[in-house]
């Protein structure tokens, strides 16, 4: 059961936190306009990967977006690689974990086939966090580093009295979407993988011996596990135990309605 | 037709209090931000005070700050100035207006006179 | 505050004569994120409210006779009437939209001669 449930929270973690990482990639406010200098702007600028707006106090937003290629900073551009990079794995992380899911039965797919998807699947939740984690990072450093840049030259002086206020950037609401779907994605990733070591197949598998009394037929399980005995219906030979380790939320007596997508 | 018209204004003793209001038509009121501009008998126009599409934001004049509040009623479609303490050097046509794009205010309302005098 | 300066305060043409009015800022009124300078013109007749003329400095808002234009960047702006007529007897007002506390100019008269 609770490899079920750490399967399946593993699941549905890494399935909201990819939602957040492809939410943060497409949203506009990763840098937003620092206020500080000029609280009472009627003009406020934000940015994104993709695109920059503007938004009036008259409620009028207009968005332009990055139509160059070759003309944006390397750093933007290792950015988006590394969000889209992140969403793509957990994309595929997704589709395997789904197939990967206990609660589903694929025809006669054998757990080790599951623990191994379970596995793959954690690995990839794991890279796709890292990937938006280390995008938003190196987005949020590069914000740093210009805004203590222009805050060293705020104001560029034109003639006297007439002064251009440099337009600083502040982190955007964008960022901190990122940091916490990474962040939620890499805990599914590893709950995934926790959920692996209990599916797999233990290494030494043991084979069932049988021993025969005249009354009774009783199995005997080496290697730590209960004893089972059978009476009637259990006197021929009778492989009982076939070495998978097996705990007892693996065992399904008869299909259930989650069984079948 | 986009219409503005103020009403309230008035005489009133200095101290006094006096609320303007701008009854809007022909657009749809809470998709606008609305500002009230003055202009003194003769002279150029002021800006007064701003409030945002939702009525979250408020600006004001440095001149009226602490005095006049603006505020909006989006059901009923109007925009109100109150204005307390009044001053002589309040006396004026305070206008109604629309922002667009550019917070550029592309409709005004006739004006109402407002005289501050003892 | 950003301050607002214009000039001439006042000019007398003949009827079909070019004109040009400046408006000043003490601070940039350019907007880096849209390129778009924050500034607008209005046109006051006598006992009339204002009309707006050009916003974002240059877009002419409609309406507006083709024989005013609306130039400038940063800090310098100008309005030009190529051909002056009889109806363009007014105040001219350039605002500051860039930021709280909106500010207008003085204005700039024009009367025909």
């Known amino acids: 059961m609770a490899v079920t449930a750490c399967q399946g929270l593993g699941f549905v973690v890494s399935l909201i936190g990819i939602a957040g990482i492809i939410a943060a990639t497409c949203m506009d406010q990763w840098s937003t306009q620092d206020l500080y200098n000029n609280p009472v702007t009627a003009v406020f600028n934000y940015q994104g990967l993709w695109r920059s707006c503007v938004r009036e106090s008259s409620g009028f937003t207009e968005c332009r977006g990055y139509f160059t290629l070759l003309g944006l900073p390397a750093m933007l551009q290792a950015v988006r690689a590394l969000m889209i990079v992140g969403i793509v794995l957990g994309a595929i992380g997704l589709l395997v974990s789904i197939f990967a899911l206990k609660c589903i039965r694929i025809g006669s797919m054998e757990d080790s086939a599951k623990a191994n998807m379970t596995l793959t699947s954690g690995i990839m939740f794991i890279v796709s966090g890292l990937c938006a984690i280390a995008g938003v990072s190196v987005f949020a450093n590069m914000l740093v580093t210009n805004f203590w840049m222009s805050t060293a030259n705020m104001y560029t002086g034109m003639g006297g009295m007439v002064q251009t206020v440099q337009t600083r950037y502040t982190f955007g609401a964008a960022l901190f979407v990122g940091w916490v779907a990474g962040g939620l994605t890499l805990i599914g990733g590893v709950m995934m993988c926790i959920a692996c070591r209990g599916l797999a197949p233990e290494e030494t598998n043991y084979k069932a011996v049988s021993y025969h009394a005249s009354g009774h037929s009783v199995a005997y399980k080496p290697g730590g596990f209960k004893a089972s005995t059978g009476f009637g219906s259990n006197t021929k030979n009778k492989k009982i135990y076939d070495g998978g380790a097996r705990t007892e939320d693996e065992v399904q007596s008869y299909p259930s309605k989650h069984d079948y997508v | 037709e986009v219409q503005l018209l103020e009403s309230g204004g008035g005489l009133v003793q200095p101290g006094g209090s006096l609320r303007l209001s701008c009854a809007a038509s022909?657009?749809?009121?809470?998709?606008?931000?609305m500002s009230w501009v003055r202009q003194a008998p003769g002279k150029g126009l002021e800006w007064v005070a701003t409030?945002?599409?939702?009525?979250?934001?408020?600006y004001y004049a440095d001149s009226v700050k602490g005095r006049f509040t603006i505020s909006r009623d989006n059901s009923k479609n109007t925009l109100y100035l109150q204005m307390n303490s009044l001053r002589a050097e309040d006396t004026a046509v305070y206008y109604c207006?629309?922002?667009?794009?550019?917070?550029?205010?592309?409709?005004w309302g006739q004006g109402t006179l407002v005289t501050v005098s003892s | 505050d950003i301050v607002m300066t214009q000039s001439p305060d006042s000019l007398a043409v003949s009827l079909g004569e070019r004109v040009t009015m400046n408006c000043k800022s003490s601070?940039?009124?350019?907007?880096?994120?849209?390129?778009?300078?924050?500034l607008s013109w209005y046109q006051q007749k006598p006992g009339q409210p204002p009309k707006l003329l050009f916003y974002?400095?240059?877009t002419r808002e409609s309406g507006v006779p083709d024989r005013f234009s609306g130039s400038g960047s940063g800090t310098d702006f100008t309005l030009t009437i190529s051909s002056v007529q009889a109806e363009d007897v007014a105040v001219y007002y350039c605002?500051?939209?860039?930021?709280?506390?909106?500010?207008f100019g003085q204005g700039t008269k024009l009367e025909i001669k």
């Open positions: 974002w400095a240059s």
């Open positions: 207006t629309r922002l667009v794009k550019g917070s550029a205010m592309d409709y």
């Open positions: 409030i945002i599409i939702g009525g979250s934001y408020t």
């Open positions: 605002q500051n939209d860039y930021s709280y506390p909106f500010t």
């Open positions: 601070q940039s009124l350019l907007q880096s994120g849209n390129q778009k300078n924050y």
């Open positions: 022909g657009f749809t009121f809470s998709s606008y931000t």
